[in-house]
């Protein structure tokens, strides 16, 4: 049994890290493999993750990591029974993938302005809470080419856009994702999308 692609891990920097790897051939990950992880900390405990299949030869493991802080470092050992297949380490603060924003809502009754709001997925005492900025994707449900991204480079989880910038009488969808520049994070997954009908009417022009 051989590891084809070594485990790579990302952390939501709150309580969960996800590691993925590929084996040399078809593998029943949960039956054959275990990922053992341990915080490099005085008298810390050994934890074990039972991986799930991610395709025929791919495995994924969800590692619970309590109270992550910047200095945390974990040892990782991938075992097949008594055979050590791979040994590595993982520092969550250096491999951050934020949680997706939540509760995306579109308010259409704000005088010719669309107001989009969402919630920061982190509690206020988490290090990432004040570090997140966002990208909002808005697209026309019936026309995939009518899609745009708005960069929200401030921390407030809101976006205002003029309804007139979108086509009238069309259904639109929006979704939002987050990243933490100061942690050199990757983008989060997109939030679930929310749908609305753009009923904005062009003002009648008199000639």
């Amino acid at each position: 049994m051989k590891v084809l692609q070594e485990p790579t891990c990302v952390s939501d920097y709150i309580s969960l890290s996800t590691c993925e790897w590929k084996m040399g051939g078809p593998t029943n990950c949960s039956a054959e493999l275990r990922l053992v992880y341990q915080l490099v900390f005085l008298i810390s405990e050994t934890n074990m993750c039972v991986p799930e299949n991610n395709g025929a030869a791919g495995c994924v493991c969800h590692l619970f990591m309590e109270d992550m802080v910047g200095a945390d470092n974990y040892t990782l050992d991938l075992w097949a029974g008594q055979q050590l297949l791979w040994k590595g380490s993982f520092k969550p603060s250096e491999h951050v993938k934020p949680k997706a924003p939540e509760n995306l809502t579109v308010y259409t009754n704000v005088s010719e302005t669309l107001l989009l709001t969402w919630s920061n997925p982190y509690p206020p005492d988490n290090y990432l809470y004040e570090k997140l900025t966002y990208a909002v994707n808005i697209w026309n449900e019936n026309d995939p080419t009518d899609s745009r991204i708005y960069d929200v480079t401030y921390q407030e989880p809101t976006l205002r856009i003029a309804a007139s910038t979108l086509k009238s009488g069309v259904s639109y969808r929006a979704r939002v994702r987050a990243w933490a520049q100061s942690y050199n994070s990757t983008w989060s997954e997109w939030s679930p999308s929310t749908k609305w009908y753009n009923a904005y009417k062009e003002p009648f022009e008199k000639h």
Partner: nanobody, 119 residues
Amino acid sequence: QVQLQESGGGSVQAGGSLRVSCAASGSTSYRYCMAWFRQAPGKEREAVASIRPRSGRAYYADSVKGRFTISLDNAKNTLYLQMNSLKPEDTAMYYCAASDNDGNCQDYWGKGTQVTVSS
């Protein structure tokens, strides 16, 4: 710089209890790890318990699990070790230690407090 000062050691009969304290002063950069070590005469220094100050998560050596409790009062900047059901083999000098970003918890040390358990 961080200064650590232990207190509360003393002599106690086997089966008794004792609480030792460690007052931290100076920088609060030690906030990654705090711990208690002990060293008995003629033996190597050993880790007894450690704590993650942010969450209060505690870890214990097998020899003291269920008998000793490590805790931290953040407001008082004081680390405690409550020792119950003491045994003669718990006799040692007890040291408080701390670190700012090292999981081995040994950047800063106190001078120690003596605990003697007689049978």
